[in-house]
């Protein structure tokens, strides 16, 4: 590159204590240097601004990828909120239904327990009543034993 | 640093008025500047070449991070999503399971109305019945009287 | 820009072709370049360390907020997790329910048949009983028998 | 001290070639504009050639142009003349001096004799 | 290129006499004058740089003057080692060009 080229031989420009005028030559190689530094630089600069502006140009594109992404992770935080509470009313709302079956599980125990006494009531008048009949004076006017005599064999 | 230094003394060069020739000892001042300032360059463009690479690696590890963030973003989303999906699938199914047991109530509530006058019935009949025994012709073919009369009672 | 100058008038130091000495005002126009050249690199790389220093703090900045919004995402992804199990214990409980609801109906459905079978059972008895009581020997001693008969019917 | 020591010069035909050498050594070479000079037998001094002390400017007599070529070799402390298409009127001893600005050719080697002839 | 005129081409002297040896340019040099010595078989050797200035080791008996276009060599008491030829050369400008010299000879 112009900028790293070896400056090297003007160092030591006639180390001896004459004075010696400088050759036009040496101030033309001079001139070429830092006409070419100039060049460099300006190059560079060039270059420089361009890559920083590219740099910047993504940094905004970043910021903005950066509000969205957040947005996006806000709304998310938020669904997710509104989504906790719809399980939470979910939760109370099964929990609910669940004492509800619990209750009505209760409720259908006790009404069994009923329905074996109103069973067992109900097969004892059965057998009561078949004693009933058929204790009856044998009559051709009481047709109703035999029926009901069928009805409980 | 060399890109710093006071470069002012080439303002007077040559002290001699009459001079037409540029003295050795002043191109020498030059050619260091020129020198330095090439070095100072050379810093610099190293340099800032070396940030600039450090800063596009950064705004590329930025990027692929990004990327990840998004995707993350984008599965958290979409879980979300599901999730939202699941827990009205839950809200219906909760609300069938409510109706449901709303229902089974209702029959429950029936079933015991049911019950209570199935009770009032069979309470009449035992009544009758007992009253029907205790009024028959007292016969010792009738043992059961004693016996319904007890179970009544 | 000084960095921007035309340095072209280098090239042709010194009208005299024939001179090998460089004239004073020649080094004096390279001197005067230089120092140009060395103020605009000097404005360069401080406007440029400028920017890169920008740069760095807004590539600091991101990395914060990458992390913050990384360690947001984390936890939207834990808080989901819990949500999905959270929900995976609500449709567990919901199915518990829900089969309870049908053992319960199932359990209802039966003793609905049991309370028909026993209905049927209560009327039978009721229409023996009946046809009992009007087949009895007409006698004062049984009052029952008008108040069965209109129970009945 | 300062010395310099020419080589290479012998006959050559006419349209031949002949490089020339010249080693210095008790001062900074790399410092120094070098320049050969000829002086034809019985004749007066010529100046020929002569390099900038980083061997990129260079500059030649018209008689010379485009047939001879400096060079140098600071790494070597050595200057040389290429000479091709030589004539009879390029005999001459051939020296090598150092060339201070404006305080002239304070330094000579003691020559070397170039003869162009069929 | 500038044209160095060199006056007498050659010139009988004795010890002891005091001799000039001129130089004209055909163009203003200032001072960029410089004056050789050359004897038979040997290199030539700067005695005078810039017009007046002695080259280390030369004889102060030697001296230079003139500027501009016009300029003379002067040996004070010539000294037998003196007769030799001499060659002025300008270093204004390029091509570098020498005098056609002066041979000083013992009468």
């Known amino acids: 590159s112009r900028i790293d080229q070896d400056n090297s031989s003007f160092d030591s420009l006639s180390p001896e204590p004459k004075s010696r005028f400088a050759m036009l030559d040496d101030v033309k190689i001079l001139a070429n240097g830092l006409l070419q530094l100039g060049h460099g630089l300006k190059d560079f600069v060039h270059k420089t601004k361009g890559q920083i502006n590219d740099i910047f140009q993504k940094l905004n594109i970043f910021d903005q990828s950066f509000y969205d992404l957040s947005l996006q992770t806000s709304e998310i935080k938020e669904e997710e909120k509104e989504l906790r509470r719809t399980t939470y009313k979910l939760q109370v709302k099964n929990e609910e239904v669940k004492n509800m079956s619990l209750e009505l599980n209760s409720k259908l125990e006790s009404l069994l327990e009923e329905k074996i006494l109103l069973q067992q009531k109900v097969k004892y008048l059965e057998e009561q009543l078949t004693n009933l009949i058929q204790n009856q004076p044998e009559t051709p006017e009481h047709p109703e034993v035999t029926s009901l005599k069928t009805f409980v064999e | 640093s060399r890109i710093d230094q006071d470069n002012s003394s080439f303002d007077s060069l040559s002290p001699e008025p009459k001079s037409r020739f540029a003295m050795l000892d002043d191109v020498k001042i030059l050619a260091n500047g020129l020198l330095q300032l090439g070095h100072g360059l050379k810093d610099f463009v190293h340099k800032t070449k070396g940030q600039i690479n450090d800063i596009f690696q950064k705004l590329n590890i930025f990027d692929q991070s990004f990327y990840d963030l998004s995707l993350q973003t984008s599965e958290i989303k979409e879980e979300e999503k599901e999730l939202r999906r699941t827990t009205y699938k839950l809200q219906v199914k909760n609300e069938e399971v409510k109706n449901m047991s709303l229902e089974l109530n209702s029959k429950l509530e029936s079933l015991l109305e049911e019950k209570i006058l199935l009770q009032q019935k069979v309470k009449y009949l035992e009544e009758q019945l007992t009253n029907l025994i205790q009024n028959q012709p007292e016969t010792p073919e009738h043992p059961e009287v004693t016996s319904l009369k007890t179970f009544v009672e | 820009s000084r960095i921007d100058q035309d340095n072209s008038s280098f090239d042709s130091l010194s009208p005299e072709p024939k001179s090998r000495f460089a004239m004073l005002d020649d080094v004096k126009i390279l001197a005067n370049g230089l120092l140009q050249l060395g103020h605009g690199l000097k404005d360069f790389v401080h406007k440029t360390k400028g920017q890169i220093n920008d740069i760095f703090q807004k590539l600091n900045i991101f990395d914060q907020s990458f992390y913050d919004l990384s360690l947001q995402t984390s936890e939207i992804k834990e808080e989901e997790k819990e949500l999905r199990r959270t929900t995976y214990k609500l449709q567990v409980k919901n199915e518990e329910v829900k089969n309870m609801s049908l053992e319960l109906n199932s359990k209802l459905e039966s003793l609905l048949e049991e309370k028909i079978l026993l209905q049927q059972k209560v009327k039978y008895l009721e229409e023996q009983l009946t046809n009992l009581i009007q087949n009895q020997p007409e006698t004062p001693e049984h009052p029952e028998v008008t108040s069965l008969k209109t129970f009945v019917e | 001290q300062v010395q310099l020591v020419e080589s290479g010069g012998g006959l050559v035909k006419p349209g031949g070639s002949l490089r020339l050498s010249c080693a210095a050594s008790g001062f900074t070479f790399s410092d120094y504009y070098m320049s050969w000079i000829r002086q034809a037998p019985g004749k007066g001094l010529e100046w020929v050639s002569y390099?900038?002390?980083?061997?990129?400017?260079?500059y030649y007599a018209d008689s010379v142009k485009g047939r001879f070529t400096i060079s140098r070799d600071n790494a070597k402390n050595s200057l040389y003349l290429e000479m091709n298409s030589l004539r009879a009127e390029d005999t001459a001893v051939y020296y090598c001096a150092r060339d201070s600005s404006q305080l002239g050719f304070d330094y000579w080697g003691q020559g070397t004799l170039v003869t162009v002839s069929s | 290129d500038i044209q160095m005129t060199q006056s007498p081409s050659s010139l009988s002297a004795s010890v002891g006499d005091r001799v000039t040896i001129t130089c004209r340019t055909s163009?203003?040099?200032?001072?960029?004058l410089n004056w050789y010595q050359q004897k038979p078989g040997k290199a030539p050797k700067l005695l005078i740089y810039t017009t007046s200035t002695l080259q280390s080791g030369v004889p102060s008996r030697f001296s230079g003057s003139g500027s501009g276009t016009d300029f003379t060599l002067s040996i004070n008491s010539l000294q037998p080692e003196d007769f030799a030829t001499y060659f002025c050369q300008q270093t204004y400008s390029n091509p570098l060009t020498f005098g056609g010299g002066t041979k000083l000879e013992i009468k």
């Open positions: 163009q203003n040099i200032i001072n960029f």
């Open positions: 390099i900038g002390s980083s061997g990129v400017n260079m």
